[in-house]
Interface confidence: low
């Protein structure tokens, strides 16, 4: 399957060559999404002062963004591969509605927003192939997601800026935790 080169842009290996291993692909994919999030955060921070706001000030929000907890089995202590993989997939599925919300929130980084969304869909699909216990994975209700999206889009400008910042920050943290956990699998 087609595979990208290494991190060095001067890599001369053919773009279509032998595939990466399953775990290497996932690792690279998450890092690719994290790069996209960094670009989006840059635009958000340039546009508003949300990035300067303290974590505490931003903690008071009614967004139900996925977060890793001890019980999810993704941390070093109490690590549980199956439980953790289910949590990662479930969390990514829950983030999808928020990534959809981000699609109209960027001007110069519109492409990055779409790249993050599309690459996350692909990551989910790939992780689902890896998961054995697919029954334990709950898919978010489309009706609930649609109404959440409407509510988010109806917020005033300041709240929309804050929501965008929170989504990006939470998604980054979730992916970083996922990356660490997946490297143990």
């Amino acid at each position: 399957a087609p595979v990208p080169p290494g991190e060095d842009s001067k890599d001369v290996a053919a773009p279509h060559r032998q595939p990466l291993t399953s775990s290497e692909r996932i690792d690279k994919q998450i890092r690719y999404i994290l790069d996209g999030i960094s670009a989006l955060r840059k635009e958000t921070c340039n546009k508003s002062n949300m990035c300067e706001s303290s974590k505490e000030a931003l903690a008071e929000n009614n967004l139900n963004l996925p977060k890793m907890a001890e019980k999810d089995g993704c941390f070093q202590s109490g690590f549980n591969e199956e439980t953790c993989l289910v949590k990662i997939i479930t969390g990514l599925l829950e983030f999808e509605v928020y990534l959809e919300y981000l699609q109209n929130r960027f001007e110069s980084s519109e492409e990055q927003a779409r790249a993050v969304q599309m690459s996350t869909k692909v990551l989910i699909q790939f992780l689902q192939k890896k998961a054995k216990n697919l029954d334990a994975i709950t898919t978010p209700d489309p009706t609930t997601n649609a109404s959440l999206l409407t509510k988010l889009q109806a917020q005033n400008q300041w709240l929309q800026d804050m929501t965008t910042h929170l989504i990006l920050r939470s998604f980054k943290e979730f992916l970083q935790s996922s990356l660490r956990a997946l490297r143990q699998m």
Partner: antibody, heavy 122, light 111 residues
């Protein structure tokens, strides 16, 4: 808005060369490839080759090896495809298309240029 | 090279009816369980447009009446309810290995 804008139509003599350009705009991520595909009149699509944005990595279809040269100039965001030793059967519309350079994206050609008609005739 | 064979070569379907196009690869285009299969729509005088990537994922702005399925060597593109604007030639393409190869195309018309 992502755009791939190609150079204009060309009429060439058999044995000569043609160089088609493809200027990319509207995106900044480096994780893309420019692929070249051609389509003879009334025929299907035929992949010719691929280049990275900076022209560092190039891969050609065996059929065109030795006759096609794909290059790219990162400073102007322009890719080029040169086909030499032209013959009448090279008469076709030549397209550049962008695919994502991402380990789990599927090399689907998500954006296309408008096409450049190359006519080879004596 | 992987050879892609589409069937039928042409297809006439009534407006509002379902249209199905098949594509068979000479060898599996799956890798790590992912099908490296894409579908394109091409209207006269226009470049192709990406409809489906990775067998079943719709491209940006593609209406949900278009869907794709399959894995391994056998794939299907389905248009659930044909609209007048769907008249075009449809191509499958594998991106599992170089050279990327396309099917010969299926011409879809209104009955």
């Amino acid at each position: 808005q992502v755009q791939l804008v190609q150079s204009g139509a060309e009429v060439k003599k058999p044995g000569s060369s043609v160089k088609v350009s493809c200027k990319a705009s509207g995106y900044v991520l480096p994780n893309y490839l420019i692929e070249w595909v051609r389509q003879a009149p009334g025929q299907g699509l035929e992949w010719m080759g691929v280049t990275t944005p900076g022209g560092g990595t190039i891969n050609y279809a065996q059929k065109f090896q030795g006759r096609v040269t794909i290059t790219a100039d990162e400073s102007t965001s322009t890719a080029y495809m040169e086909l030499s030793s032209l013959r009448s059967e090279d008469t076709a519309v030549y397209y550049c298309a962008r695919s994502r350079w991402d380990p789990l994206y599927y090399y689907a050609l998500e954006y296309w240029g408008q096409g450049t008609t190359v006519t080879v005739s004596s | 090279d992987i050879v892609m064979t589409q069937s039928p070569d042409s297809l006439a379907v009534s407006l509002g009816e379902r249209a199905t196009i098949n594509c068979r690869a000479s060898e599996s285009v799956d890798n790590y369980g992912i099908p490296f299969m894409n579908w394109y729509q091409q209207k006269p005088g226009q470049p192709p447009k990406l409809l489906i990537y990775a067998a079943s994922n719709r491209g940006s702005g593609v209406p949900d009446r278009f869907s794709g399925s399959g894995s391994g060597t056998d794939f299907t593109l389905t248009i659930s309810s044909l609209q007048a604007e769907d008249v075009a030639v449809y191509y499958c393409q594998q991106s599992e290995e170089v050279p990327l190869t396309f099917g010969q195309g299926t011409k879809l018309e209104i009955k």
